[in-house]
């Protein structure tokens, strides 16, 4: 992973008490909306609150949503695909049921 | 099965530092935060901070920003808290949680 | 003073409906922050009751429900049972304190 020094760039024994600066918040933050994060990141789930979390990358795993109402609620959510990147079942990845599937960011 | 399964009670003097660990199995390590949540006897429960099992990164409650590192090592899929400079009102139960399943505890008590 | 305030006791026969508040402010609970519900049995870690303001993990009956509204939350307990005696906290997060917060606990005690 990239080793930033805090969740919201501060000096590592910072506790972001402080709202000094109104910087875009940074992996780990705590968010309501992706506006409150910066770029690479969207606000999703992380059960106790909604934290910035990095947009999937090519080959990243990713979550393919069912049709609305078909799912329970994600307490563990993943970003969605980068610019370019859609989430597609994984070609090589064969299961004996379509639910299983693997699916990964892949190119358009 | 997700377990969370603490190192042992810990009876330190004043002054001194105590470091409590927390090994998980049953999922991906790297994947999740591990916040760590002290309860002293007969009183509620207070977050101290979490560290993000992947990259090492670390956000403290205000309070112990002074006396407390999170840390982890990957290779073992074990999470660690240290608290320094103990004082009597630090005896308290300390749990690890990865939010949604808990470690059961480990008691540290500060007497001289 | 506590973030999340709740009442430190209550009780109910069995059978009867309780209800615990969780009163919060315009920094945690009103500002659209999750609340999620533990409860804890003496000696034993916190476990999850009610999770992001009304949901329900597996294996927690539908006797429990929570809710939310503007500053505050609620758990309520339908059809109380002598094994639902225990210690119980809202949580949330604080975007003033940039900390997750508990609420002071609520000591629950079934009558007779």
């Known amino acids: 992973g990239n080793d930033h020094s805090t969740l919201d760039g501060y000096s590592r024994r910072t506790t972001l008490s402080s709202k000094m600066y109104h910087s875009k918040g940074q992996e780990g933050s705590v968010c309501l909306r992706s506006s409150d994060c910066a770029t690479g990141l969207c606000c999703a789930r992380h059960f106790w609150s909604k934290i910035c979390k990095p947009v999937l990358k090519e080959g990243q795993v990713c979550t393919k949503h069912r049709r609305k109402g078909s799912h329970g609620l994600e307490i563990f959510q993943r970003c969605y695909c980068g610019e370019g990147l859609s989430c597609r079942i994984q070609k090589d990845h064969h299961q004996a049921s379509n639910s299983s599937r693997l699916h990964t960011c892949q190119r358009h | 099965e997700v377990q969370l399964v603490q190192s042992g009670a810990e009876v330190k003097k004043p002054g001194a530092s105590v470091k409590v660990s927390c090994k998980a199995s049953?999922?991906?390590?790297?994947?999740?935060?591990i916040h760590w949540v002290r309860q002293a006897p007969g009183q509620g429960l207070e977050w101290m901070g979490w560290i993000h099992s992947n990259s090492g990164a670390t956000t403290y409650a205000q309070k112990f920003q002074a006396r407390v590192t999170m840390s982890r090592d990957t290779s073992s899929s074990t999470a660690y808290m240290e608290l320094s400079r103990l004082e009597s009102d630090d005896t308290a139960m300390y749990f690890c949680?990865?939010?949604?399943?808990w470690g059961k505890g480990t008691m540290v008590t500060v007497s001289s | 003073q506590a973030v999340l305030t709740q009442p430190s006791s209550v009780s109910g026969a069995p059978g009867q409906r309780v209800s615990i508040s969780c009163t919060g402010s315009?920094?945690?609970?009103?500002?659209?922050?999750?609340v999620h519900w533990y409860q804890q049995l003496p000696g034993t870690a916190p476990r999850l009751l009610i999770y992001?303001?009304?949901n329900r993990p597996s294996g927690v009956p539908d006797r429990f429900s929570g809710s939310k509204s503007g500053t505050s939350a609620s758990l309520v307990i339908a059809g109380l049972q002598a094994e639902d005696e225990a210690d119980y906290y809202c949580q949330s997060y604080d975007n003033s304190l940039n900390a997750y917060v508990f609420g002071t606990g609520t000591k629950l005690t079934v009558l007779g």
């Open positions: 949680s990865r939010e949604d399943y």
């Open positions: 992001v303001n009304n």
């Open positions: 315009s920094s945690n609970i009103g500002a659209a922050y999750d």
């Open positions: 049953g999922y991906t390590f790297t994947d999740y935060y």
